[in-house]
Amino acid sequence: YDFTNCDFEKIKAAYLSTISKDLITYMSGTKSTEFNNTVSCSNRPHCLTEIQSLTFNPTAGCASLAKEMFAMKTKAALAIWCPGYSETQINATQAMKKRRKRKVTTNKCLEQVSQLQGLWRRFNRPLLKQQ
């Protein structure tokens, strides 16, 4: 999906209002310095591409993020503020439901969510408005 035409400010507002708090809840008990952020993004569409990948694509050691509260709210925000996003996700969602197993918060998942926080931070505060 090409995130170029999303309403970035509306997605930012959704993140700051709710999604960020859910990420904090997920990471509760983890020090902010515990994981080193290695995933980066260059602009807002790229950030959303990386956020989508880390949030919804199962990875080795962490297959369980997609049903977390922050993930569901992320999905809702993208569906509302990114034209045509919902249609592209129908097949992916059905496949994900078939794969879904019990919810386990692993250290790998915590590391992945820490990376997500860094991506969202970058999405929210791009230094793109040079005078």
Epitope: Y15, S20, T33, N37, S40, S42, R121, N124, L127
Partner: antibody, heavy 120, light 111 residues
Framework: EVQLVQSGAEVKKPGSSVKVSCKAS????????MHWVRQAPGQGLEWMGA????????SYNQKFKDRVTITADKSTSTAYMELSSLRSEDTAVYYC?????????????WGQGTTVTVSS | DIVMTQSPDSLAVSLGERATINCRAS??????????MHWYQQKPGQPPKLLIY???NLGSGVPDRFSGSGSGTDFTLTISSLQAEDVAVYYC?????????FGQGTKLEIK
């Protein structure tokens, strides 16, 4: 706990340049915007510019654009602010500051400040 | 540039009394329903410290006698019951548009 440690006080001649460093420790460096703010004696706060160390992208206050250069070295977790063509009105305390964890955009960690005095 | 104008420039309030500082932006600092305005406290010889973020949210470790309100162009910082340690200079800051800009500061003293 994240800390920002700045280089020591500088005394410079008008027309010269100064380069102030800001070393981050205790946390991730590359995925946080790092800002530079200055404060002239008895005056308020003035934003100079910022850098995203992850890719070196910068944003500058137009007032300083031709004179200020902000850089970062990811390998040493250090940000730098160089100000050229110094004049007496550049005498100030220069602060580096890091944005918060959540993208709210407030400055939650500050360096101790570096006093730069410009005098002939 | 968005100009931030604080009032008053200085303020003297008795211990235990309410202190109110206003900040007006030359144009709206709101975006998608959120107000991108922060408040800082600065004591002599120290860097600023965050008090309030996004107009009304209390910063981490900040006493709840501090509160913020407002939207659009008009914002207020309130200290409900002034304590001796609140003597400082207070700054508003907008981050909605580059360049980021601060108010000129309000010096708060004890009467």
């Amino acid at each position: 706990e994240v800390q920002l440690v700045q280089s020591g006080a500088e005394v410079k001649k008008p027309g010269s340049s100064v380069k102030v460093s800001c070393k981050a420790s205790g946390g991730t460096f590359s995925t946080y915007n790092m800002h530079w703010v200055r404060q002239a004696p008895g005056q308020g706060l003035e934003w100079m510019g910022a850098i995203y160390p992850g890719n070196g992208e910068t944003s500058y206050n137009q007032k300083f654009k031709d004179r200020v250069t902000i850089t970062a070295d990811k390998s040493t977790s250090t940000a730098y602010m160089e100000l050229s063509s110094l004049r007496s009105e550049d005498t100030a305390v220069y602060y580096c500051a890091r944005e918060d964890d959540y993208g709210e955009g407030y400055f939650d960690v500050w360096g101790q400040g570096t006093t730069v005095t410009v005098s002939s | 540039d968005i100009v931030m104008t604080q009032s008053p420039d200085s303020l003297a309030v008795s211990l235990g009394e309410r202190a109110t500082i206003n900040c007006r932006a030359s144009e709206s600092v709101d975006n998608s329903g959120l107000s991108f305005m922060h408040w800082y406290q600065q004591k002599p010889g120290q860097p600023p410290k965050l008090l309030i973020y996004r107009a009304s949210n209390l910063g981490s470790g900040v006493p709840d006698r501090f509160s913020g309100s407002g939207s659009g162009t008009d914002f207020t910082l309130t200290i409900s019951s002034l304590q001796a340690e609140d003597v400082a200079v207070y700054y508003c800051q907008q981050i909605n548009t580059d360049p980021l800009t601060f108010g000129q500061g309000t010096k708060l003293e004890i009467k």
